[in-house]
Structure formats: structure tokens, C-alpha cells
């Protein structure tokens, strides 16, 4: 905290300019008018103030706006944003995407700081949902953003926003998140033709149910093994050998390399060895011939 002292004669700042970098902290406090600072915030970014000097400028803004800064000031904070705490940011009401972009730019190229996480949270809550433009912006700055959200938060993403999602944005999503995103993607891409649809839906298939995988197997999609390995185990288990063969097309040969890993391992255990042998891949571990397979889950459902 800088103590209050009178501004020396001739030192009152008529504007925010480079001469202020030569002011001591107490001179900045005494000689810079807070209202002037607020109206000329856009200049601060270009002036090489030290962090101690930025502390003084922040203190002046805090005194002027104890309830939180107006958006006209927030948009021009620039590097002063690095001085803000999450508590400061919780007082803000940020509604403009341009303001959000301006502040994300300050943090560009680095992982999400607590300040940025709070800012995004405030912005999204203010908008009520993650619209396409917001999602576009956030994933451009932070490809992992979508997967940092909880399934509950993801439920507020409208299907129309799914068009903004790139495959790399889903790299770190877990099955619970994909369970929420997949139905939205299915809805968003429903009017596309077969091959185009598959290209778009592929990244989301970790949330697909069995019936959708069965439907895809009828469309000559040639799913690659990397995608197959990310499918839900419970969705893969009921697929027949013929369905998996159609689903993977020429990539079916890759099953051999993955036979010890889920979901391939668990799927093999559920297939008749006879059926597996028809693939000619030497997959082992299926149900021996002559054994009866009881589907207990079906029996429980009937009783």
C-alpha cells in the first residue's frame, strides 16, 4: 500500500504517457488521477511500467471501482490483467467476446492460469451457454478447454456449437464427457451424408451406444483402430464379429496387435472362437465351440 502524499508541484500527470515510468511509486499514487487512468487504459500497455508501478495503477483503479471494473476498462487492461486476482475478476461482468479475446491474448501460449479460468467461467455464466463463437475462441486459445469442463457444464453446450469443435479439442476428454457430447454431435451433423458424417462424428464416437455402432457398420466407414480403441467397452461388447469386420473394413487386421487391450480383449472373450477364426487373424480367447452362452443381463431384464 502506498501512503498518501501530496503531488509535487509540476508533476501532476496531464495524460498517461512514458514520462510516468520515471515516477516513483508514491508519485504515481499522488499525481495520476484515477479517472484519467481509466479513460486512457489503452495507453498503459505500450508503456514499460515495472510490476511495482502496475501495482500502484491497479490500486488506483480498485479505489475508483470498488464494486468491479466496467467493461470499458477491462477491455484495455492488457498486461495489467496479470495483476488481477480471481477475486478481482469475480466482480466483473464481461459480456463482449472482444474483451475476452483481448485478455486471453495476454496469456497466449501458456497454460490456463487461475485468472483466465475465472474469467472464462464468468463470461460463460454471463452468456448462459457455450455458444459457437465463444467455443471457437476458447478452443483456439486452449485446445484442451472443452475437456476441462464437467459433464454438467458440457450439458449447456448447444448442438450448434459442436461445429466449432476440432478433433484435437477432444484429445483429453474422458468417456463421461464424450457421453454428453456425442448426442449433441449426432444432432448437429444429422443432415450430412454418410462419409462426410463419419468424418465429423468420428472424434465423438467414444460416447456412441451399440446401436449407433451397428448402424455405422452398415455404411462402409472403415473406422481406424485408434478410433475403435476409444469406443466404450459396453458399446463394443454386443457387436458381432461380422459387424466389427464391416465397421473396421481393411483396418480389421489391426485387431491382432490390440488383442490384449480393452475394448478388443473384452470383446474377444464374448465371441465364439469359430467366428473369430473366420477373420483369419489368429485371435485367441473366444468361447470354445459347443459352449452355450447365456446372456444373463437379458434374463434379468425379462424377469
Amino acid at each position: 500500500e502506498v501512503e498518501k502524499t501530496a503531488c509535487p508541484s509540476g508533476k501532476k500527470a496531464p495524460e498517461i504517457d512514458e514520462s510516468l515510468i520515471f515516477y516513483k511509486k508514491w508519485e504515481l499514487e499522488a499525481c495520476v488521477d484515477a479517472a484519467l487512468l481509466a479513460t486512457q487504459m489503452d495507453r498503459v500497455n505500450a508503456i514499460p511500467f515495472t510490476y511495482e508501478q502496475l501495482d500502484v495503477l491497479k490500486h488506483k483503479l480498485d479505489e475508483l471501482y470498488p464494486q468491479g471494473y466496467p467493461e470499458s476498462v477491462i477491455q484495455h487492461l492488457g498486461y495489467l490483467f496479470l495483476k488481477m486476482s480471481p477475486e478481482d475478476i469475480r466482480k466483473w461482468n464481461v459480456t463482449s467476446l472482444e474483451t475476452l479475446k483481448a485478455l486471453l491474448e495476454v496469456n497466449k501460449g501458456h497454460e490456463m492460469s487461475p485468472q483466465v479460468a475465472t474469467l472464462i467461467d464468468r463470461f460463460v455464466k454471463g452468456r448462459g451457454q457455450l455458444d459457437k463463437d465463444t467455443l471457437d475462441t476458447l478452443t483456439a486459445f486452449y485446445p484442451g478447454y472443452l475437456c476441462s469442463l464437467s459433464p454438467e457444464e458440457l450439458s449447456s453446450v448447444p448442438p450448434s456449437s459442436i461445429w466449432a469443435v476440432r478433433p484435437q479439442d477432444l484429445d483429453t476428454c474422458d468417456p463421461r464427457q464424450l457421453d454428453v457430447l456425442y448426442p449433441k454431435a449426432r444432432l448437429a451433423f444429422q443432415n450430412m451424408n454418410g462419409s462426410e458424417y463419419f468424418v465429423k462424428i468420428q472424434s465423438f464416437l467414444g460416447g456412441a451406444p451399440t446401436e449407433d455402432l451397428k448402424a455405422l457398420s452398415q455404411q462402409n466407414v472403415s473406422m481406424d483402430l485408434a478410433t475403435f480403441m476409444k469406443l466404450r467397452t459396453d458399446a463394443v461388447l454386443p457387436l458381432t464379429v461380422a459387424e466389427v469386420q464391416k465397421l473396421l473394413g481393411p483396418h480389421v487386421e489391426g485387431l491382432k496387435a490390440e488383442e490384449r487391450h480393452r475394448p478388443v480383449r473384452d470383446w474377444i472373450l464374448r465371441q465364439r472362437q469359430d467366428d473369430l477364426d473366420t477373420l483369419g487373424l489368429g485371435l485367441q480367447g473366444g468361447i470354445p465351440n459347443g459352449y452355450l452362452v447365456l446372456d444373463l443381463s437379458m434374463q434379468e431384464a425379462l424377469s
Epitope: Y51, L82, G109
Partner: nanobody, 119 residues
Framework: QLQLVESGGGLVQPGGSLRLSCAAS????????MGWYRQGPGNERELVAV???????SYADSVKGRFAISMDNDKHTVYLQMDSLKPEDTAVYYC?????????????WGQGTQVTVSS
């Protein structure tokens, strides 16, 4: 993190010249400005000259026309050419760098180099 190492200080007669250098190493990306501060006996540290990453320089009134600051962005080095030195320029000169992005935003300082102007 960011390290700054100054060199070039020494004893010089009034009217003489010295050239200080400050080399930055470590997290040198995102340095937006580098400058020279000094602290004379019994005085507080004061800014002498600063230069931004875009090459814009500013000088304290007491050194205008005598000192020149320059920056070699490729070498991440800042220089202070000091001419027409006066006894009142005697001080420890500190190099400073502003780093304006995460994960380590802040002001970074060198250890200082002594400049003594005396006959």
C-alpha cells in the same frame, strides 16, 4: 526463470565513457522491455533508461544527451553507452527486464555493476 548478468562497470574519470552490457538467459521469450536503474550512495533506486522490445527508448532528464540505450534482440542483450560521465553518475547500475506473460510474469533484476566517476 530469467537470469540477467551485467558487465562493463569500473572506475572512470569525469568526462570519460563506459559501456555497460546486460545479457539475459533462461526464459527470454516475452521480454517486453529492458532498462537500466541506478542506486547512488544514500539514494533510492532510480530509472536511468529503458527500451521496449520494439526499440523505443526513454531517458531520465539527468542523462538525456549523454547516455544511449540499445538492445540486441537476437542476443537478448541490452547496452548502456555512457558518455560525458559526471561524479554524480557514480552508483551501482542494475539491469532490469519486464516479462509480461505467464508462467513467470514480473520484473527481473541483475546483481548490479559498480560505476565510479572520480579523478
Amino acid at each position: 526463470q530469467l537470469q540477467l548478468v551485467e558487465s562493463g562497470g569500473g572506475l572512470v574519470q569525469p568526462g570519460g565513457s563506459l559501456r555497460l552490457s546486460c545479457a539475459a538467459s533462461g526464459s527470454v521469450n516475452s521480454i517486453t522491455a529492458m532498462g537500466w536503474y541506478r542506486q547512488g550512495p544514500g539514494n533510492e533506486r532510480e530509472l536511468v533508461a529503458v527500451i521496449t522490445d520494439r526499440g523505443r527508448a526513454s531517458y531520465a532528464d539527468s542523462v538525456k544527451g549523454r547516455f544511449a540505450i540499445s538492445m540486441d534482440n537476437d542476443k537478448h542483450t541490452v547496452y548502456l553507452q555512457m558518455d560525458s560521465l559526471k561524479p554524480e553518475d557514480t552508483a551501482v547500475y542494475y539491469c532490469n527486464a519486464h516479462r509480461r506473460t505467464w508462467p513467470h510474469p514480473g520484473d527481473y533484476w541483475g546483481q548490479g555493476t559498480q560505476v565510479t566517476v572520480s579523478s
